[in-house]
Interface confidence: low
């Protein structure tokens, strides 16, 4: 289920899957929510630790049992991912942090009159992930009112420093507030060039696009279909970026599909989950559990309820069925995507709906029926 | 509308004109007013133009040539395109427009009632399509709102006429076997309405078709009843009251 409570002065021991710098616990929790394996997190505010390297440290954690031992640590904040928390799931983070400089690659500097304007500039710049703004009272006069637009390889700051009269924050693109607008077209038989930032396996281009949308550095993608001429590249989703923010070239290429991240859409973003079930497809991965259930939809529900499950395969092979129930293979991987996609199998595959923000959520709202 | 006739004031008070203002201003699609602040239209109207600030929505009008720079229009607060709509396919061709400011209802500007969820049992025999679209395939936008009475066609019959396309249960077709009367380019997004028990209901949203008014090529419409859950979800306000006209 959905666990929203935060644990003050507590730190989860072990289970680390990733670490980064974040300005507060809420942002750390959001990163945990969107990380494929993170179930728990611990955050170290600047006041909680003398070690400069670990200040603002956000530690993402996994656990086979779903929990880890808590140790006392003054100032630390720990909690759970919001996977399975329905419409509390959002990549939107509006907070502005005073007295904090979030470090990264500074690629644009301009003079603006307020931190809000700086945040707006970041939101309206295709490559900007976060920003820092030197206020009117910043100690060096030549830097006053400077708005620095930034990015980093992981989308989070490479360091966070306490610095007076500096204010920092994140792009509001995930809040669907970008003025850029987005290309919703999917381009059949077209391959994009430029820099690959990641490679995952997906069953179709729409899953590829959603993954691109929620990847911090993906601006566009190319997907190689299951009939692509090179067998080892079939179902490969290449997440891409470029200096300009758009593909520098596109090549007509049969059995490829390309498109853009939808992060710059002005309306709501696509849900960070994939609800479609793929008949005749087997998703390979690390086995989490095998259970007998009645029907593929129940298999998907079972995967969704088991928080560590990322995807599933429901087998219809006679040897995998007992009366009306068949084997439901609950699986996971390092990146949340299948490690192998096989076609022509007797069964169906799909993804957990744990990140669907339309999911059932009794924590924060009471549903009312329409008259 | 091919084979139609002029409408009169207040005859179709839910009909709106979706226009784009770039250098010039032109009518691109129709739409239906379903609440003080909501318009239902086709998703494909926004293909290539998803920028809400270029759109102007004219309601309570009959003649496009009456529109001047002083004619009031609504602007878009939000465009909600169905999450499963794809430009390359005809499925889920439905979009909601939230207006920046609510409209007052008058005799010339009021909403159309929506069907009940999954309405499959009602047999509609009096159905009309309206719009300012082309009056022939290679035609032009019409000044006066046109109307045409068209019978619904079963999905099985429609599928026979469109072998290359999947006619899903979430589509509804309308047309004459001999052709001659149909929606056409520029009518997209507008209403297919049917009168039943004295009440007009929005049965379809003008979506696509092979040419216009061709023999044995009916028009294909998005079946509104199949999207009631989606419409209610997207239009529900924070106090839980649906902000649109649903049947009593």
């Amino acid at each position: 289920g959905c666990l929203t409570q935060l644990y003050e002065n507590a730190f989860f021991r072990g289970g680390d899957v990733a670490s980064m710098y974040t300005p507060n616990a809420q942002y750390c929790q959001m990163r945990c929510t969107f990380h494929p394996r993170c179930l728990l997190f611990s955050f170290l505010p600047a006041s909680s630790i003398n070690d400069m390297e670990k200040r603002f440290g956000c530690f993402l954690k996994d656990s086979v049992t779903g929990t880890l031992p808590k140790v006392h640590r003054t100032g630390a904040v720990s909690g759970h991912s919001l996977k399975q928390c329905g419409h509390q799931i959002s990549a939107c983070h509006r907070d502005i942090y005073k007295g904090v400089d979030m470090r990264g690659v500074n690629f644009n500097v301009s003079k603006v009159s307020s931190v809000e304007e700086c945040q707006k500039r970041c939101t309206s710049n295709i490559r900007c992930q976060f920003f820092s703004y030197a206020t009117q009272t910043f100690h060096k006069a030549e830097y006053r009112n400077n708005c620095l637009l930034k990015y980093s390889p992981g989308g989070t700051p490479t360091a966070i420093k306490v610095l007076s009269n500096v204010e920092s924050g994140f792009s509001l693109k995930p809040c669907a507030l970008s003025e850029i607008g987005c290309h919703m077209n999917i381009f059949q038989h077209l391959a994009f060039s430029d820099v690959d930032v990641a490679r995952v396996l997906t069953p179709d281009a729409f899953v590829c696009r959603t993954i691109c949308t929620y990847h911090p550095n993906c601006l566009f993608f190319t997907f190689y279909t299951n009939v692509w001429k090179i067998e080892s590249q079939r179902n490969v989703c290449l997440l891409k970026t470029s200096e300009s923010g758009t593909p520098s070239s596109s090549t007509p290429q049969e059995n490829t599909i390309s498109g853009y991240s939808l992060l710059t859409c002005k309306r709501t973003l696509p849900e960070p989950c994939h609800s479609k079930i793929y008949p005749g497809v087997d998703f390979g991965g690390e086995e989490l559990n095998v259970t007998f259930v009645k029907g593929v939809n129940v298999c998907q529900e079972t995967c969704t309820k088991m928080i560590r499950c990322q995807f599933f395969t429901y087998s219809l092979l006679p040897e995998d069925c007992k009366e009306e129930k068949c084997k439901c293979f609950l699986r996971l991987s390092m990146d949340g995507s299948p490690t192998r996609i096989a076609y022509g199998t007797q069964g169906s595959s799909g993804y957990s709906l744990r990140l669907c923000n339309t999911g059932d959520n009794s924590v924060c709202t009471t549903k009312t029926s329409t008259r | 509308i091919v084979g139609g006739t002029n409408s009169s004031w207040g005859e179709w008070p839910w009909q709106v004109s979706l226009q784009v203002k770039l250098t010039a201003q032109r009518h691109l699609c129709g739409g239906s007013l379903i609440g003080h602040q909501w318009v239902l239209t086709a998703a494909h109207c926004f293909d290539g133009l998803p920028l809400q600030d270029v759109w102007r929505i004219y309601s309570g009008i009959l003649n496009l040539s009456d529109i001047t720079k002083d004619t009031p229009f609504s602007q878009i607060k939000e465009i909600i395109i169905h999450q499963n709509y794809k430009v390359s396919e005809g499925n889920h061709d439905i979009a909601l427009i939230k207006l920046q400011a609510p409209l007052n209802y008058t005799e010339f500007q009021k909403p159309i009632c929506l069907p009940s969820k999954g309405d499959t049992s009602t047999i509609y025999t009096n159905c009309w399509v309206t719009g300012w679209g082309f009056s022939k395939e290679k035609g032009e936008i019409q000044n006066i709102l046109q109307k045409v009475n068209i019978p619904l066609v079963t999905n099985e019959e429609c599928q026979k006429r469109y072998q290359d396309y999947k006619i899903t249960q979430r589509m509804v077709c309308a047309g004459y076997k001999e052709g001659g009367k149909d929606a056409c380019k520029g009518d997209s997004g507008g209403p297919l309405v049917c009168k039943h028990n004295g009440m007009w209901r929005l049965v379809g949203i003008t979506s696509w078709g092979e040419g216009c008014a061709r023999r044995e090529q009916p028009g294909v419409y998005t079946k509104v009843a199949e999207y009631m859950d989606w419409i209610l979800e997207k239009t529900q306000s924070s106090d839980g009251k649906a902000q649109m006209q649903s049947p009593a």
Partner: antibody, heavy 122, light 106 residues
Framework: EVQLLESGGGLVQPGGSLRLSCAAS????????MMWVRQAPGKGLEWVSG????????VYADSVKGRFTISRDNSKNTLYLQMNSLRAEDTAVYYC???????????????WGQGTMVTVSS | DIQMTQSPSTLSASVGDRVTITCRAS??????LAWYQQKPGKAPNLLIY???TLESGVPSRFSGSGSGTEFTLTISSLQPDDFATYYC????????FGQGTKVEIK
Amino acid sequence: EVQLLESGGGLVQPGGSLRLSCAASGFTFSHYIMMWVRQAPGKGLEWVSGIYSSGGITVYADSVKGRFTISRDNSKNTLYLQMNSLRAEDTAVYYCAYRRTGIPRRDAFDSWGQGTMVTVSS
Amino acid sequence: DIQMTQSPSTLSASVGDRVTITCRASQSISSWLAWYQQKPGKAPNLLIYKASTLESGVPSRFSGSGSGTEFTLTISSLQPDDFATYYCQQYNTYWTFGQGTKVEIK
């Protein structure tokens, strides 16, 4: 009525450059994929380049890739073809055309301009 | 790339004749094929799209058939206005034209 009017053709030396324009009217230019198609004297039709409605995606025939650049200005309803490093074999009448997208798939070029002649010769 | 091969390259016929032009694709293009007519000094004119659908305003003596890799354009009764060059064009994967068939007076 749909109209496409090409201009900018003429005589140019090998290695030179030309910029062709196509002014469109009578349809919603910003919604359409636009194309350039050429026809060498006494020869058949050859697709040269295409640009998607937003202008973000461009595609080229292998014979012109790296030398020609297609672009559009939706606010001016105009399509362009910047031709660099011209060769004798680029001599042709250049047509602009458009196709409808969406459903049903009407991807044939259903409207053409009258063409503009480009001659590459020393 | 998909290649389109038209045959014959030239066809001599008389008014009233039934004329057939064939077009072969190097791989399956489903029904995504168009036929054009072009007269000297003029732009091409779309006759048929989706292999068999007649463009609005085109006389019914023109018809198209085929799918996959084999397609034909038929003129049931050749008229004086029909002497021209005809091109097929695939649009399954981008766009490729056939080399053309010139229909001339016998």
